[in-house]
């Protein structure tokens, strides 16, 4: 069986301020077991945007219902975009671990650009 890949098909997305951004991500396998997280930026200072395993993220909705056991679509929508949301977003698959899950594979990233509302 081929190793799981995390696919972010869009290199960049342009969204007008106040609109909703859709960031696409799919996994090619259900294995290994473990959650998906979305981050803005890379490295130790990256910002958590959505965590499948924990928490409620009011601005973020998932495109698919992640409670369904065979789901492999981890795309998200971020509402009410502002210029402060610009950046590169990474969809990251974690492998279940003990005590902590371990980062397994990251998508290539999607750059979100925000167009100012026309005055």
């Amino acid at each position: 069986e081929e190793e799981l890949q995390v696919i972010q098909p869009d290199k960049s997305v342009l969204v007008a301020a106040g609109e909703t951004a859709t960031l696409r991500c799919t996994a090619t396998s259900l294995i290994p077991v473990g959650p998906i997280q979305w981050f803005r930026g890379a490295g130790p200072g990256r910002e958590l945007i959505y965590n499948q395993k924990e928490g409620h993220f009011p601005r973020v909705t998932t495109v698919s219902d992640l409670t369904k056991r065979n789901n492999m679509d981890f795309s998200i929508r971020i509402g009410n975009i502002t210029p402060a949301d610009a950046g590169t977003y990474y969809c990251v698959k974690f492998r279940k671990g003990s005590p902590d899950d371990v980062e397994f594979k990251s998508g290539a990233g999607t750059e979100l650009s925000v167009r100012a509302k026309p005055s």
Partner: antibody, heavy 120, light 106 residues
Amino acid sequence: EVQLVESGGGLVQPGRSLKLSCLASGFTFSDYGMIWVRQAPGKGLEWVASISSSSSYIYYADTVKGRFTISRENAKNTLFLHMTSLRSEDTALYYCARRYYGFNYPFDYWGQGVMVTVSS
Amino acid sequence: DTVLTQSPALAVSLGQRVTISCGASKSVRTYMHWYQQKSGQQPKLLIYSASNLEAGVPSRFSGSGSGTDFTLTIDPVEADDIANYYCQQSNEPPYTFGAGTKLELK
């Protein structure tokens, strides 16, 4: 076999405190969010509090906010509910339940419940 | 908060089809779950995320709906199904339950 066993209930006077425990077995406790739900005698189900797998995210019902504290010890497979300033309306059967992964997931296993009676 | 409205009771005959409804005060997308509670027992998950049958639950139970209107269907009803049924949303905090529907025999 998944098991959730609550303990620590009993009769307590208004204004006093009580600490409930829920011992989990048969699954990897640290993978699951945990929830307390209560049911007053003859009434329906009311969510009380929830805690994520690593304790990073905690939520309370408005009716208990500031009085109840949910916590967990993953090393001991145990969930807690520390209840203070108890009121007569807190009288209920308290259930612990587990929730796989994130906020949107359902409560797939429940304990048998422990009775808390607040009365003078 | 998201208020969930259920009819308080339904009288049914064994072998018939019964539909229990749950209305949400605002959209919960598909994050609606159904539980069965028999007298003196803890709740048991039947259906998760509107239409998914939980493992081990008989196929006579089914769920449907999205947004604000949801239904739990039992077809055919058996004696073992006499219980209270609760809907619960997990779209946003706070989690809320419906007041429950009591399934009774005619």
